[in-house]
Interface confidence: medium
């Protein structure tokens, strides 16, 4: 039975040209995290594998940095970066947990962070 929950940074916003940290945290489970995928719609951004470490997809390597922790840092943001991001935790023996973050990249300097929320 999957008992874990993923806490994410929720709905967030950031300025065009700036950076943002995408963070997820898996709690309430003793399952071993074997891999974390970061994805945007159907595009794989990065993988953090327990054995291999980090791998950033070649098409994103100039604008994506690993960390902090299992999070992901997006740099040089553009309006096109607006959208849904998913952290996918591969765990054993539980299976897969998915967290969702919505990022809005703003033209103006008004960029407020949304509240944290949980996905069961």
């Amino acid at each position: 039975m999957m008992t874990g929950t993923i806490e994410t940074t929720g709905n967030i916003s950031a300025e065009k040209g700036g950076s943002i940290i995408l963070q997820c945290h898996l709690s309430s489970t003793t399952a071993q995290v074997t891999q974390v995928n970061w994805e945007q719609q159907d595009q794989l951004l990065a993988i953090c594998n327990a054995d291999l470490g980090w791998h950033i997809s070649p098409s994103f390597k100039d604008r994506v940095a690993p960390g902090p922790g299992l999070g992901l840092t997006l740099q040089s943001l553009t309006v096109n970066d607006t959208g849904e991001y998913f952290c996918i935790y591969h765990t054993y023996p539980d299976g897969t947990y998915t967290g969702r973050i919505f990022l809005e990249v703003l033209e103006s300097s008004v960029a407020e962070h949304g509240a944290r929320f949980q996905i069961p």
Epitope: Q32, T34, Q35, N37, E39, D42, Q43, L44, I47, N49, A50, D51, L52, H55, S57, P58, S59, I88, H90, Y92, P93, G95, T96
Partner: antibody
Framework: EVQLLESGGGLVQPGGSLRLSCAAS????????MSWVRQAPGKGLEWVAG????????YYADSVKGRLTISRDNSKNTLYLQMDSLRAEDTAVYYC??????????????????WGQGTTVTVS | QSVLTQPPSASGTPGQRVTISCSGS?????????VHWYQHLPGTAPKLLIY???QRPSGVPDRFSASKSGTSASLAISGLQSEDEADYYC???????????FGGGTKLTVL
């Protein structure tokens, strides 16, 4: 040392069954997706089936759907291929292979970095 | 008929540079999926040579390189050596077939 060792191949009559096994060692088996790839005599490599690290997601080539079944036992570090309703065209060397990642949402991206030596299946 | 098209054979002399092409379509090489290259000597386990279009696994000499453009990919081997004589396969996930597909393989001969 990362190692994959296939077994279970042999000679079988058309319509018969076989179960191939692949024993994994030297890496965390529960972290990675796995696949079976075959090579018929005088032909190239052909992917047959794949399975995610947890066993929840399975993928098959059209040519084997409904006849071949991939599974894994993570407690035994072993990958299986159950082969039913075998045909002459299934004659090949069957390789098991480890993917670079777990394979739930990323199976389509990452290739196979470790392969076994293969086991021969002859349908005749 | 393979989904990915490779020349059946290629050859070169020691020290030469050889290129092997791999042609696909918009549903495999032309998508956001990646191309992988394998080296296979008959009777042995296939070996991953290049992954994610152009990345070399540790232990693979930098004489091997690869690139992708549009619906085609290519593998280049510089400073050809006798031990490079083998079959080379390109591979990618095909979205239309929902399957990993391989090229027909290219037999490289070192003269």
């Amino acid at each position: 040392e990362v190692q994959l060792l296939e077994s279970g191949g042999g000679l079988v009559q058309p319509g018969g069954s076989l179960r191939l096994s692949c024993a994994a060692s030297g890496f965390t088996f529960t972290t990675y997706a796995m696949s079976w790839v075959r090579q018929a005599p005088g032909k190239g490599l052909e992917w047959v089936a794949g399975i995610s690290y947890i066993g929840s997601d399975k993928y098959y080539a059209d040519s084997v759907k409904g006849r071949l079944t991939i599974s894994r036992d993570n407690s035994k570090n072993t990958l299986y291929l159950q082969m039913d309703s075998l045909r002459a065209e299934d004659t090949a060397v069957y390789y098991c292979a480890k993917h670079l990642t777990g394979g739930t949402t990323d199976y389509y991206y990452y290739g196979m970095d470790v392969w076994g030596q293969g086991t021969t299946v002859t349908v005749s | 008929q393979s989904v990915l098209t490779q020349p059946p054979s290629a050859s070169g002399t020691p020290g030469q540079r050889v290129t092997i092409s791999c042609s696909g379509s918009t549903s495999n090489i032309g998508t956001s999926r990646y191309v992988h290259w394998y080296q296979h000597l008959p009777g042995t386990a296939p070996k991953l040579l290049i992954y994610l279009d152009s990345q070399r696994p540790s232990g693979v000499p930098d004489r091997f390189s690869a690139s992708k453009s549009g619906t085609s990919a290519s593998l280049a081997i510089s400073g050809l050596q006798s031990e490079d004589e083998a079959d080379y396969y390109c591979s990618a996930w095909d979205d239309s077939l929902s399957a990993w597909v391989f090229g027909g393989g290219t037999k490289l001969t070192v003269l």
